[in-house]
């Protein structure tokens, strides 16, 4: 779209951003014993033409980027989303006040890409 | 940016949208013999709190949605991205004008989710 070519707006490309999440901030401190928080990270940034190799773009994202260039009113750009996620182990109280150690999948963003 | 939605809008939830892509529209008609185009589809829509089961949200997306609620200036909502992609077979001319049949992965969006 026209805004894609606005040189005065420096939009950063899709990448991983650091983010520490405190379970207290989420209001989960009463049931999560440990850890107190974790480095969750998040993905953000533009998936604009041309998509370079760092953007881990799928074939569909490459096609969608081209379609968006010509039809931005109808088709959005691909979005910047996690491509690799890691698990974390959490010690918590269950509903019966038992202490449980459980591995929660897909909690930490390790890499981002255009999807 | 100018392309952002107005806050007054009724935003639809993340879902798959139908999209037929013509290879001629992409300017690829000279090297792709068949098909003439394909149903690529795309993902679009909001990943807003609360994320319901239809949104195929990862654990990270659920956490990010909560963080966004508290810090919308700093952390974006998760984005609506493909969760299932299919391949298509394409008949095309290579650089030496040989006719090649190749399966291209991740070309068709089958399902979307909040990531």
């Amino acid at each position: 779209s026209a805004s894609d070519y606005n040189s005065s707006e420096l939009k950063t490309a899709c990448r991983k951003h650091e983010l520490y999440v405190s379970f207290q901030d989420l209001g989960w401190q009463d049931w999560i014993i440990a850890p107190k928080g974790y480095a969750a990270n998040y993905c953000d940034g533009e998936c604009s033409f041309p998509l370079n190799a760092h953007m881990n773009a799928t074939n569909h994202a490459i096609v969608q980027t081209l379609v968006h260039l010509m039809n931005p009113e109808y088709v959005p750009k691909p979005c910047c989303a996690p491509t690799k996620l890691n698990a974390i182990s959490v010690l918590y109280f269950d509903d019966n006040s038992n202490v449980i150690l459980k591995k929660y999948r897909n909690m930490v963003v390790r890499a981002c890409g255009c999807h | 940016s100018a392309s952002d939605y107005n806050s007054s809008e009724l935003k639809t939830a993340c879902r798959k949208h139908e999209l037929y892509v013509s290879f001629q529209d992409l300017g690829w008609q000279d090297w792709i013999i068949a098909p003439k185009g394909y149903a690529a589809n795309y993902c679009d829509g909001e990943c807003s709190f609360p994320l319901n089961a239809h949104m195929n949200a990862t654990n990270h997306a659920i956490v990010q949605t909560l963080v966004h609620l508290m810090n919308p200036e700093y952390v974006p909502k998760p984005c609506c991205a493909p969760t299932k992609l299919n391949a298509i077979s394409v008949l095309y001319f290579d650089d030496n004008s040989n006719v090649i049949l190749k399966k291209y992965r991740n070309m068709v969006v089958r399902a979307c989710g909040c990531h």
Epitope: A2, E73 | S3, N6
Partner: antibody
Framework: QVQFVQSGAEVKSPGASVKVSCKAS????????IHWVRQAPGQRLEWMGW????????DYSQNFQGRVIITRDTSANTAYMSLSSLTSEDTAFYYC???????????WGQGTLVTVSS | DIQMTQSPSSLSASVGDRVTITCRAS??????LGWYQQKPGKAPKRLIY???SLQSGVPSRFSGSGSGTEFTLTISSLQPEDVAIYFC?????????FGQGTKVETK
């Protein structure tokens, strides 16, 4: 048949704002994008911006960024273009026009003359 | 931005003459070009889309050709009602840009 009817001519003072309306009929309003284009005297047509009438998404030409706002009312099948901080150089005919996916403009409004004069 | 250069800026021809208007794009736009006719005090009307496809309801004396950077609008036999301004529009990439127009008159 597809038709666009725009609001009447306006005379504005420098620094003022103008809001032009464009009522669509003859098709499903929310299925297509509406663009706004203007033509100043002796000048070529100039693209201003668009709105997706279905979801309200907009984009604007850099030449008007910050001064133009395009909106729509789906219950009234109407699109609006507001232009602020008017100068004499904004004296022009303003057109709404429909853009179908993958195509150029197929139908236009009759135009609205906006005159900026002190 | 893609620049659209249209020529001539004006022309005068006799009824029945073949008239040709050219649009040149500053970069390749494939076939993403439309031709429009605008009569005084009227809204533009699309004659040709996708560089060479005739809009429904438009007389067959109008035709379009070209691809890439060079495009032509031809009126095979000029009629009195064809007196108007004609312009091209590229819709390959935003911002969309227009030719400056060609004023067609009859002798």
């Amino acid at each position: 048949q597809v038709q666009f009817v725009q609001s009447g001519a306006e005379v504005k003072s420098p620094g003022a704002s103008v809001k032009v309306s464009c009522k669509a009929s003859g098709y499903t309003f929310t299925n297509h994008a509406i663009h706004w284009v203007r033509q100043a005297p002796g000048q070529r047509l100039e693209w201003m911006g668009w709105i997706n009438a279905g979801n309200g998404k907009t984009d604007y030409s850099q030449n008007f960024q910050g001064r133009v706002i395009i909106t729509r009312d789906t219950s009234a099948n109407t699109a609006y273009m507001s232009l602020s901080s008017l100068t004499s150089e904004d004296t022009a005919f303003y057109y709404c026009t429909r853009r179908v996916y993958g195509e150029s403009y197929d139908h236009w409004g009759q135009g609205t003359l906006v005159t900026v004069s002190s | 931005d893609i620049q659209m250069t249209q020529s001539p800026s004006s022309l005068s021809a006799s009824v029945g003459d073949r008239v040709t208007i050219t649009c040149r794009a500053s970069q390749g736009i494939r076939n993403n070009l439309g031709w429009y006719q605008q009569k005084p005090g009227k809204a533009p009307k699309r004659l040709i889309y996708a560089a060479s496809s005739l809009q429904s309801g438009v007389p067959s004396r109008f035709s379009g050709s070209g691809s890439g950077t060079e495009f032509t609008l031809t009126i095979s036999s000029l009629q009195p009602e064809d007196v108007a301004i004609y312009f091209c529009l590229q819709h390959q990439i935003y911002p969309w840009t227009f030719g400056q127009g060609t004023k067609v008159e009859t002798k």
